[in-house]
């Protein structure tokens, strides 16, 4: 009896610890898209509607906060497109990018962890023009660092929110 | 504030050429498209080209490929419409007109004509 | 080749009236859609566009509505001034305008 007892705490414990584990799914807000045909900053995203989801993590001022020291998966997906209905591509050649970037508050600094992308030719004879870029990647992170995303050209981001998102799981505490 | 001054009235004979301006002012020139836009008597307007004003890059309609060219001095914040081989039916007022979204916005240039210039009357006539 | 096409071609209307003009495309350009005003020997005038979205400087008595491939353009109170021909626009095509007049 007592093992059991103690089995039924050991699954409580996991249990517990595993609804703990952080993780942030966060999608891109489309009314809310900044202008410009450099790189930028994306800095609004949904964190509780739809697919977006988010805890033990903060979405604060355009940053996905890590709140717990540990190892985490990062990912980002972004997908480009433009529709003749829309206008014409004022340019034909295109760099369609994302960087996932690292700041740390407690020594300020800022580090690129991922980049993804191309160079694209993107005729004026086509109708429609799609592309997608998907990163991710296994970080160190500690307490109070800030994820942000940039990209470039962000007039021609897909809004949806199965197209325009990022997000990140603990996978393991630092020993 | 913005404005777009074009070159004056202008007649010509059927076969010959005509070269339109389009001085702008009170905006960052090479940050905006331009476009041409003309409208011959008792039709509808009728859109001709644009250019992006910052890297020259042009696009025309299917009707005007091979007899329209779209230039623009950045220095001279001017825009030029040349039409060549006139014939009667280009007789109508050609008007140019700044695309609303400028390419610090955006590289779309989204067809929202949000400044024009005040037209200038060409007559094609023998 | 998308075709815009406007009704009416022309209307007359009473100082005060409530003015509707249709435009339709031929097939579904979400809400790319402007508005343009034109007066004989003046530079046309952008009124609305995306649809619904009023051009700065522009009175409030106008006003924009419709999606997919049917748009109206509302004067809710014409006035004198409102005398002129309106052209409705997606991208590189017009509509074949529609004259105001008063009666």
């Known amino acids: 009896e007592k093992a059991m007892v103690d089995g039924s705490w050991l699954d409580l414990a996991k249990r517990s610890k595993l609804e703990a584990q952080p993780f942030a799914h966060l999608t891109i807000n489309a009314t809310d898209i900044p202008s410009g045909s450099h790189k930028v900053s994306l800095s609004s995203w949904y964190h509780d509607r739809g697919w977006a989801k988010i805890s033990n993590m903060t979405f604060s001022n355009g940053k996905l906060i890590v709140n717990q020291d540990g190892f985490y998966y990062l990912y980002a997906n972004i997908c480009f497109r433009h529709h003749e209905t829309s206008g014409d591509l004022a340019t034909e050649y295109l760099q369609l990018m994302v960087y996932v970037t690292k700041t740390s508050i407690k020594i300020p600094s800022s580090h690129t962890l991922m980049k993804g992308g191309s160079t694209k030719y993107w005729s004026g004879n086509s109708e429609f023009h799609f592309y997608s870029i998907n990163v991710g990647g296994f970080f160190k992170l500690r307490s109070g660092e800030e994820i942000s995303i940039e990209v470039s050209n962000p007039s021609l981001l897909d809004p949806d929110q199965d197209a325009t998102y990022f997000g990140a799981f603990k996978v393991r505490d630092i020993d | 504030q913005v404005q777009l001054v074009q070159s004056g009235a202008e007649v010509r004979k059927p076969g010959a050429s005509v070269k339109v301006s389009c001085k702008a002012s009170?905006?960052?020139?090479?940050?905006?498209?331009i476009h041409w836009v003309r409208q011959a008597p008792g039709q509808r307007l009728e859109w001709m080209g644009w250019?992006?004003?910052?890297?020259?890059?042009?696009k025309f309609s299917q009707k005007f490929q091979g007899r329209i060219t779209v230039t623009r001095d950045t220095a001279a914040s001017t825009a030029y419409m040349e039409l060549r081989s006139l014939r009667s039916e280009d007789t109508a007022v050609y008007y140019c007109?700044?695309?609303?979204?400028?390419?610090?916005?955006?590289?779309?240039?989204?067809?929202?004509?949000?400044?024009w210039g005040q037209g200038t009357l060409v007559t094609v006539s023998s | 080749e998308i075709v815009m096409t406007q009704s009416p071609s022309s209307l007359s209307a009473s100082v005060g009236d409530r003015v509707t003009i249709t435009c339709r495309a031929s097939?579904?350009?979400?809400?790319?859609l402007n508005w343009y005003q034109l007066k004989p020997g003046k530079a046309p005038r952008l009124l609305i566009y995306?649809?619904?979205s009023l051009q700065s400087g522009v009175p409030s008595r106008f006003s924009g509505s419709g999606s997919g491939a049917e748009f109206t353009l509302t004067i809710s109170s014409l006035q004198p001034e409102d005398i002129a021909t309106y052209y409705c626009?997606?991208?590189?095509?017009f509509g074949q305008g529609t004259k105001v007049e008063i009666k």
């Open positions: 007109a700044r695309d609303s979204s400028g390419m610090v916005r955006g590289i779309i240039i989204a067809y929202y004509f949000d400044y």
């Open positions: 009170g905006y960052d020139f090479s940050n905006y498209a």
């Open positions: 250019i992006n004003a910052g890297n020259g890059n042009t």
């Open positions: 097939q579904s350009i979400s809400r790319y």
């Open positions: 995306g649809a619904s």
């Open positions: 626009q997606h991208t590189r095509a």
